[in-house]
């Protein structure tokens, strides 16, 4: 039902859902800190623009008695329970930040009259695509899928002269929330990825994966998986790998590859790592940067959600427009705003755009090097290292089907 919003007369409130079931196991007070840092910045920006208004956040915690798995499995009802709590307290803000689980976001979107914007740090699944009042500030599965199709089709680069049309996907059900939905999208028979590939098989058992590595009768040389290097090592160990195998390791929210003094372990030589660019600067084929402590993408998305709200609030107030309208609810898309680490671009459907980076292990230096970058906004690949020192024959990626191209 419709809830009155605390969103007028110069006072604007943000409702922040602090759910026990979350896409990432981030300490909740840390997310509060991120929100409060964002509020400080927003207040400063509004003040600089001559807008004398109050912006606050209300943190809505669930009791955690029923929905206490800690991950996203029991999140479907938790989101609705929190909305009910907001409704009963008549404490809805101008915007809802949270939930991060695909299940809860989908259900909340389905079961409520969304006349207010919802900003999510997560909600990676395809079921949260194309939602009119939902904004997602972490790369959703659709973006990954478009990169993979683009890369598979590419055949005009010095290091990739074959189009690919096949793939194995390793998915064993123990994945983190982001990986679960990324792989789910690749597995779905109706997805863009499946539609564009001629052959795709999901490997669900460790042994299936391990057998493929040296199977002469394999149907594809390419295996997609999601997780970090340690996850791959647990699975692959020091097993021998056929020389034309290419493992694509999707590890978007991990910037350890960009640390100084990081050496790629030997088991990564057959692997291309897909991760997000660590900053807005153009990446060279080698890099170093000051890393922010720990993986902070989730907290950063919360903070950027606050900055996005501040950006929209500023625009609407400067134009003398009402905040509690469908126009405001639908406005959080097709724009660029000043995020914490630089400009953040949202596409026509309110999903964050980013620069994805494909890394390889140099056989010379044992360092991770940038092979290419991909701009999700324009769906375009930009080669970076034109003569990579690959492990693969002739320093070129093999064909995806054994028996054709370099073996």
């Amino acid at each position: 039902s419709q809830v009155s919003q605390n969103c007028h007369n110069g006072s604007y409130e943000i409702s922040v859902l602090m759910m026990g079931n979350s896409a990432f196991a981030e300490p909740l007070k840390n997310l509060e800190d991120a929100v409060n840092e964002g509020l400080e910045i927003v207040r400063g920006r509004l003040q600089n623009a001559g807008l004398n208004v109050t912006v606050n956040a209300t943190f809505m915690y669930s009791d955690g008695l029923i929905h206490n798995s800690g991950d996203c499995r029991s999140s479907t009802c938790e989101g609705l329970d929190l909305l009910r709590k907001i409704s009963n307290a008549q404490r809805m803000g101008c915007v809802l930040i949270g939930p991060s689980c695909t299940y809860s976001t989908f259900q909340m979107y389905l079961d409520t009259e969304l006349s207010y914007p919802m900003i999510s740090a997560g909600s990676f699944g395809l079921s949260c695509d194309y939602k009119e009042t939902l904004t997602r500030l972490m790369s959703p599965a659709r973006k990954l899928m478009y990169f993979l199709v683009n890369f598979w089709k590419t055949n005009d680069l010095p290091f990739k002269t074959y189009s690919w049309s096949t793939s194995y996907v390793y998915k064993n059900g123990t994945e983190t929330e982001d990986c679960f939905w990324y792989l789910n999208a690749l597995e779905a028979s109706v997805s863009y990825f499946s539609h564009e590939l001629g052959f795709k098989v999901v490997l669900r058992q460790d042994k299936e994966f391990q057998d493929i590595l040296m199977d002469h009768n394999r149907k594809s040389n390419v295996i997609i998986m999601c997780g970090g290097p340690e996850f791959l090592y647990k699975l692959k160990g020091d097993r021998a790998v056929a020389e034309d195998i290419v493992i694509i390791l999707v590890d978007l929210f991990n910037d350890q590859y960009f640390e100084d003094n990081v050496t790629a372990p030997d088991y990564m030589k057959n692997v291309l790592v897909l991760t997000l660019s660590p900053g807005n600067s153009l990446l060279n084929s080698s890099f170093s940067r000051n890393l922010s402590p720990t993986k902070r993408d989730f907290a950063l998305a919360y903070l950027n959600g606050i900055l996005l709200f501040g950006h929209m609030l500023k625009i609407f107030l400067e134009n003398g427009e009402n905040i509690t309208t469908p126009k405001f609810a639908h406005a959080f898309r097709n724009l660029t705003f000043e995020g914490y680490d630089g400009p953040v671009t949202l596409d026509d459907w309110g999903d964050v755009d980013s620069t994805m980076v494909l890394l390889y292990t140099s056989v010379d230096t044992k360092k991770y090097k940038v092979l290419l970058t991909y701009d999700t906004h324009v769906n375009k690949t930009y080669p970076v290292d034109m003569s990579p020192t690959f492990t693969w024959k002739n320093s070129k990626l093999p064909n995806d089907i054994t028996g054709r191209g370099p073996q």
Epitope: E37, N290, P293, L300
Partner: antibody, heavy 120, light 108 residues
């Protein structure tokens, strides 16, 4: 009252290991990151690393990689740091500290400190 | 690694005197990531100022902080005997988190 109570002083032989504990009270340990800091006598503090008590994920200072192992026991609200292959250079006061800011960027509560003396 | 250089290393001040301690970073950092601590002999360090200018809970208003980029400062508006301590700046912008070498403040 929010407190971080650390285990008592340790006198250890070179080459040995030590495991320091830090028990949190007055707050829920999983709500914040926990960092560990080394302070040698007369020197400035050095950040060793931090741990997310929810999943045990750690971030560390390369200088202490392989030297310090951070763990958390959520049931007892206790964080631990195991420090290996001790030398005289490791004689110092070790603090646990509660991380604040966007992903543990400063420390608002410090532990009582544990003095470790390495001597043969 | 971001290096923080504090100055002066030691200083003595009379009660009522205004004190300024500076902290210079080897590369530019966001003001959200610079913090100050006070350490009295025999005690654990205590958070004084976070995010450049925010006073931590229970810290007297005579303490203030400012700065941006590579240059930051801590000011004590009017020195008191209880302010005798060593003061450290700390950055949270890059791994590893690092502290300045400290400024020892004594009573004249």
């Amino acid at each position: 009252e929010v407190q971080l109570q650390q285990s008592g002083p340790e006198l250890v032989r070179p080459g040995a290991s030590v495991k320091i504990s830090c028990t949190a009270s007055g707050y829920t340990i999983t709500d914040y990151y926990m960092s560990w800091v080394k302070q040698s006598h007369g020197k400035s503090p050095e950040w060793i690393g931090d741990i997310n008590p929810n999943n045990g994920g750690t971030s560390d200072n390369q200088k202490f990689k392989g030297k310090a192992t951070l763990t958390v026991d959520k049931s007892s609200s206790t964080a631990y740091m195991e420090y290996r292959s001790l030398t005289s250079e490791d004689s110092a006061v070790y603090y646990c500290a509660r991380g604040r800011g966007m992903v543990a960027r400063y420390f608002d509560i410090w532990g009582t400190g544990t003095t470790v003396t390495v001597s043969s | 690694e971001i290096l923080l250089t504090q100055s002066p290393t030691t200083m003595a001040a009379s009660p009522g005197e205004k004190i300024t301690i500076t902290c210079s970073a080897s590369s530019s950092i966001s003001s959200n990531f610079l913090h100050w601590y006070q350490e009295k002999p025999g005690f654990s360090p205590k958070l004084l100022i976070y995010r450049t200018s925010n006073l931590a809970s229970g810290v007297p208003a005579r303490f203030s902080g400012s700065g941006s980029g590579t240059s930051y400062s801590l000011t004590i508006g009017s020195m008191e005997a209880e302010d005798v301590a060593t003061y450290y700046c700390q950055q949270g912008s890059g791994l590893p988190l690092t502290f300045g070498a400290g400024t020892k403040l004594e009573l004249k």
